[in-house]
C-alpha cells in the first residue's frame, strides 16, 4: 500500500445525520397531526381508542434525560417498525373507507420508511447494536366492521403522534451527548 | 479531507503480539464506529473487529475472538487492535475504517511467519 | 466461503450497463438490514460506492446505481468505462454473526 491520498468527505457526519433525521422526524410528526385532523373532521373520533398491537409509549418526555443514545435509537426504530406495519395494514384492510385520506397515508408511509431507513444508517455509523431480525409478526386481524377500522385509524395516527413527539424530543437532547 | 493512516504492520512470529493504530483526521471521530477489516494476499476483504463511537460496544469476528482486543482513544483521534497468539492465517492487509464504513486507510501488512 | 454470495467475475464492453449480484440471507440482507458496496481499485484501499441499498456519496457518479430486494441486492453500472475495472465487494449486517459481512468480490473487466 502507498501513501495516504486522503478522501473527499463521502457523507454526512453522524451528527449533521442527526439533524437531518431530527427534521424528517419533525416534519413526519406534522404529518401525522394534519392527518390526525383530517380523520377527526371526517369520521368525528368518540373518546380516546387504543389498539392492543400498538407499542406502548416508549417514555414520558420528563424521564429522557436518563436515556442513553443506544436504547433511544433501538427502541425507537422497534416502535415505528410496529407503526409502519399497522399504517400498511391500515391501507390495506380500509382501502375503500379511507380513500378520502389518500394520498396522505400513502406519503406518511414512504416518509416513515424513510426514517426507519435513517435511523438505520445513523446506528451502523456508530456503530451500536442493531435490532435483532424482526419475529414474523402475527397477521394484523382485519377490523370487524369499518367504524372498527377508523376506531384503528384514530388509535395508530394517535399513537404514532405521541411516539414521534417523543423522538423530536429525544433525538434532539441525543445530539448534545454525541 | 478525511485521512486514516495506519501504523504497527510488520513481521511476527507464529504466537506473537503486535498492536495496530490508526490515526484519523479530518473528520469527527469520535462520532463514528471504528473498524478493522483486513485483506489475505489475492482474497477479499474479511471484516476482523468494531467498536461504537463512545467505546462502550466491541464486536469482533469468530476468527479473531479472544485473541484480538479492539480499542479507541477518542482524545487522540486514534483507534487500536492488539493482535495476540498470531497464526500465519492472520497474514493480510489491515486497513482501518471509520462509520459503515464510509472512509478507509490504505492499509498496514501484517505477516505471520517463522 | 463468504456469507455473502458475489458472481467471482463480471465483464462488458465500454458505454454497457452491467449488474452484479449479492445474494445473502434472513439473517443479513432479509432482515431489512442496509446493503453498502465498495470499489477497490487495483492496489488501492476500498472505497464506498452505495451505502443504504441505494444512497450515492458525493462524489460518486450517477452510473452507479444500488437496488434490494428480499435477500439479494445488485450493483448497476451503467455506461461502463475502462476506469471501472477493480473488483466490487458487497456488505450488509449479519444479526446472526454480530457483525457486518462482506461478499467473496466480483472481479470486473473491461473489455
Known amino acids: 500500500p502507498g501513501p495516504p491520498p486522503g478522501s473527499p468527505r463521502a457523507s454526512p457526519d453522524p451528527r449533521a445525520e442527526l439533524d437531518s433525521t431530527v427534521l424528517l422526524t419533525r416534519s413526519l410528526l406534522e404529518d401525522t397531526r394534519q392527518l390526525t385532523i383530517q380523520l377527526k373532521d371526517k369520521f368525528p373520533a368518540d373518546g380516546d381508542h387504543n389498539l392492543d398491537s400498538l407499542p406502548t409509549l416508549a417514555m414520558s418526555a420528563g424521564a429522557l434525560g436518563a436515556l442513553q443514545l443506544p436504547s433511544v435509537l433501538t427502541r425507537l426504530r422497534a416502535d415505528l417498525l410496529s407503526y409502519l406495519r399497522h399504517v400498511q395494514w391500515l391501507r390495506r384492510a380500509m382501502g375503500s373507507s379511507l380513500k378520502t385520506l389518500e394520498p396522505e397515508l400513502g406519503t406518511l408511509q414512504t416518509r416513515l420508511d424513510r426514517l426507519l431507513r435513517r435511523l438505520q444508517l445513523l446506528m451502523s455509523r456508530l456503530a451500536l447494536p442493531q435490532l435483532p431480525p424482526d419475529p414474523p409478526a402475527p397477521p394484523l386481524a382485519p377490523p370487524s366492521s369499518t367504524w372498527g377500522g377508523i376506531r384503528a385509524a384514530h388509535a395508530i395516527l394517535g399513537g404514532l403522534h405521541l411516539t414521534l413527539d417523543w423522538a423530536v424530543r429525544g433525538l434532539l437532547l441525543l445530539k448534545t451527548r454525541l | 479531507e478525511v485521512q486514516l493512516l495506519e501504523s504497527g504492520g510488520g513481521l511476527v512470529q507464529p504466537g506473537g503480539s503486535l498492536r495496530l493504530s490508526c490515526a484519523a483526521s479530518?473528520?469527527?471521530?469520535?462520532?463514528?464506529?471504528g473498524h478493522w477489516v483486513r485483506q489475505a494476499p489475492g482474497k477479499g476483504l474479511e471484516w476482523v473487529a468494531l467498536?461504537?463511537?463512545?467505546?462502550?460496544?466491541?464486536y469482533y469476528a469468530d476468527s479473531v475472538k479472544g485473541r484480538f482486543t479492539i480499542s479507541r482513544d477518542n482524545s487522540k483521534n486514534t483507534l487500536y487492535l492488539q493482535m495476540n497468539s498470531l497464526r500465519a492465517e492472520d497474514t493480510a492487509v489491515y486497513y482501518c475504517?471509520?462509520?459503515?464504513?464510509?472512509?478507509w486507510g490504505q492499509g498496514t501488512l501484517v505477516t505471520v511467519s517463522s | 466461503q463468504s456469507v455473502l454470495t458475489q458472481p467471482p467475475s463480471a465483464s462488458g464492453t465500454p458505454g454497457q450497463r452491467v449488474t452484479i449480484s449479492c445474494s445473502g440471507s434472513?439473517?443479513?440482507?432479509?432482515?431489512?438490514?442496509?446493503v453498502h458496496w465498495y470499489q477497490q481499485l487495483p492496489g488501492t484501499a476500498p472505497k464506498l460506492l452505495i451505502y443504504?441499498?441505494?444512497e450515492r456519496p458525493s462524489g460518486v457518479p450517477d452510473r452507479f446505481s444500488g437496488s434490494k430486494s428480499g435477500t439479494s441486492a445488485s450493483l448497476a453500472i451503467s455506461g461502463l468505462r475502462s476506469e471501472d475495472e477493480a473488483d466490487y465487494y458487497c456488505?450488509?449486517?449479519?444479526?446472526?454473526?454480530?457483525?457486518?459481512?462482506f461478499g467473496g468480490g466480483t472481479k470486473l473487466t473491461v473489455l
Open positions: 475504517a471509520a462509520g459503515v464504513p464510509d472512509y
Open positions: 479530518g473528520f469527527t471521530f469520535s462520532s463514528y464506529g
Open positions: 467498536i461504537s463511537y463512545d467505546g462502550s460496544y466491541k
Open positions: 434472513s439473517s443479513n440482507i432479509g432482515s431489512d438490514y442496509d
Open positions: 443504504s441499498n441505494n
Open positions: 456488505a450488509a449486517w449479519d444479526f446472526s454473526l454480530s457483525g457486518p459481512v
